[in-house]
């Protein structure tokens, strides 16, 4: 009954694990909140208890570790399911406390069902290979911790629903699916499924991934701008309406922010007093290089507008660039009554 | 998704002229520039110029320079070719087509292209 | 202007076989660090399709049995191994600075 720090439902952590399968998932309190691990903890006389909250439910209970076959048990920081089922879904939290001190987190565990191709409404992980770039490899994630060293299981990669097997540049190493030269064709699901004994029963992990092949970075230059250029020039009237696109092109690259913005006079847009309005969209190539287009829009343009520099810039971790746009003043076309008439000698 | 639909076909007499249209979807349209290309029956490939949508901005082939205008409207996305003082020997396939973005500054390639408009020309 | 003459006019193979088709351009039309060549496929009676561009870079959906490779003035179209549906004429293009580009006088494959 005393204050525990409740640290709330982590949603952050969104755990997922497919129904039948083990299942190790560690109290996040030693992950993301505290600044101490599970030993200290322990050695300092804490104790950490779990309990949970069914689906749909709001009654918090304890969890049933007397199942049998020993089904959901816990080992210092790490409750087990050997193995889930679909009604384990809920809210879980775990507890550390003693008499003075308490400190609890909860967060949502979701049973999900797979079907024989591996499909289901688990999320993700992507791994990026680059294109053409020689011998890369994906490793079977989360499959640490579940077996002891000495086991040695068996492991089977498919391709979306079939058996990786006799494919020509994608080959199985046991946890490593190496790509000999990776394509964009080898985008796509991939699985692993790791079948070990524990106790004279066999337990099967799957861990589904998806490859997306990207730029290579022996590929990659500094950005690219198409537009404006010295081939297209903005001749204007006053009071017509002003549009000049810049559109850059960037060479994809892992962890890069690319940036473009517009200067006009050597100022950023919104430091000056024209009535200007930016709009942006961004488009991606199949290997996520990335097309960014910034449209500057002067509704009615003065004369005045039309003697300032506009200047398009573009950053990525591969450099810096700039472009001005040719903008200018159309020359009206000479109106017969005043201008011609003169010319002629009229008065 | 880009789509590039052209008018129908067309029939013109020698000395007349023609005017064709493209209108564009499924993409920033001010941002890419627009060719024009034809084929004459059983031919290959001939470019005749290009337009930017954003500032009008056209280069023409020497060949068609004087005879061919490219215009664009804005606010319907739509590209127009107009070919002037028309002879037998243009009837031909129009085809209007986009130019691409890459990694490169220059050198660009044709990635949409309309579905073609024949003209014929004949007295 | 650049003139690109493509060879040979028409080529017949086996379904399965290798198909080439050459390109030469009459002055080189690359630059550092890329070649402005492009391939276009063209089905009886339907708009080119881009192929290749720059060279070597497969568009988007097109089967990797279509490489292109070259620089400068040569340039090459392969499509191994050949099947039905690649039965059309093949034009090789190049846009070397704004505003002149120009095509090749085509190839026309036929399936043997």
């Known amino acids: 009954s005393e204050r525990c720090d409740d640290w709330g439902l982590d949603t952050m952590r969104q755990i997922q694990v497919f129904e039948d399968e083990p299942a190790r998932i560690k109290c996040p309190l030693f992950e993301h909140f505290l600044k101490f691990n599970y030993s200290t903890a322990h050695s300092a006389g804490l104790t950490l208890i779990w309990y949970w909250t069914r689906q749909d439910r709001d009654l918090e209970e304890p969890i049933n570790f007397r199942l049998p076959e020993n089904r959901i048990s816990k080992e210092k920081d790490v409750l087990w399911f050997r193995p889930t089922l679909l009604n384990d879904t809920g809210n879980y939290t775990c507890m550390l406390r003693n008499t003075t001190y308490c400190s609890k987190v909860a967060f949502p565990l979701e049973v999900v069902q797979k079907d024989s191709c591996f499909n289901s409404p688990m999320k993700l992980p992507v791994h990026k290979l680059y294109i053409e770039y020689g011998i890369q490899r994906i490793t079977c994630p989360n499959v640490d911790g579940y077996f002891p060293s000495s086991v040695k299981p068996t492991i089977t990669w498919y391709m979306g629903c079939y058996k990786i097997q006799n494919f020509n540049n994608v080959i199985p190493e046991g946890m490593n699916l190496s790509f000999l030269i990776a394509l964009i064709s080898n985008n796509g699901n991939y699985t692993c499924v790791v079948t070990y004994p524990e106790n004279g029963r066999t337990f099967h992990l799957t861990r589904t991934l998806t490859v997306k092949v990207v730029g290579s970075p022996k590929n990659a230059v500094p950005p690219v701008i198409h537009s404006p250029n010295d081939h297209v020039v903005y001749e204007k009237e006053p009071g017509e309406e002003l549009l000049i696109p810049c559109t850059v092109y960037f060479s994809f690259l892992m962890d890069s922010r690319n940036e473009v913005w517009w200067t006009i006079d050597g100022k950023k847009p919104d430091d000056i007093t024209i009535d200007v309005t930016i709009n942006e969209s961004i488009s991606h190539s199949r290997t996520e290089d990335e097309t960014r287009t910034q449209i500057l829009s002067i509704k009615k343009v003065t004369s005045e507008d039309l003697k300032r520099s506009y200047v398009c810039h573009a950053r990525s971790a591969k450099g810096e660039v700039a472009k001005a746009a040719k903008v200018k003043q159309k020359v009206p076309a000479p109106r017969y009554t005043v201008e011609l008439a003169c010319g002629f000698g009229a008065t | 998704q880009v789509q590039l639909v052209q008018s129908g076909a067309e029939v013109k007499k020698p000395g007349a002229s023609v005017k064709v249209s493209c209108k564009a979807s499924g993409y920033i349209f001010i941002t890419y520039w627009m060719n024009w290309v034809r084929q004459a029956p059983g031919q290959g490939l001939e470019w005749m110029g290009q337009i930017f949508p954003a500032s009008g901005t056209t280069y023409y082939a020497q060949k068609f320079q004087g005879r061919v205008t490219m215009t664009r409207d804005t606010s319907t996305s739509t590209v127009y070719m107009e070919l002037s003082s028309l002879r037998s020997e243009d009837t031909a396939v129009y085809y209007c087509a986009r130019t691409d973005f890459y990694r490169y500054d220059g050198g660009y390639a044709l990635d949409y292209w309309g579905q073609g408009t024949l003209v014929t020309v004949s007295s | 202007d650049i003139v690109l003459t493509q060879s040979p006019i028409s080529l017949a193979v086996f379904l399965g076989q290798r198909a080439t088709i050459s390109c030469r351009a009459s002055?080189?039309?690359?630059?550092?660090?890329?070649?402005?060549m492009h391939w276009y496929q063209q089905k009886a009676g339907q708009p080119p399709k881009l192929l290749i561009k720059?060279?070597?870079d497969l568009e988007s959906g097109v089967p990797v049995r279509f490489s292109g490779s070259g620089s400068g003035t040569d340039f090459i179209l392969n499509i191994h191994p050949v099947e039905v549906e690649d039965i059309a004429t093949y034009y090789c293009h190049h846009s070397w600075g704004i505003p002149m580009y120009t095509f090749g006088g085509g190839t026309k494959l036929e399936i043997k």
């Open positions: 720059y060279a070597s």
């Open positions: 002055q080189s039309v690359s630059t550092s660090g890329y070649s402005s």
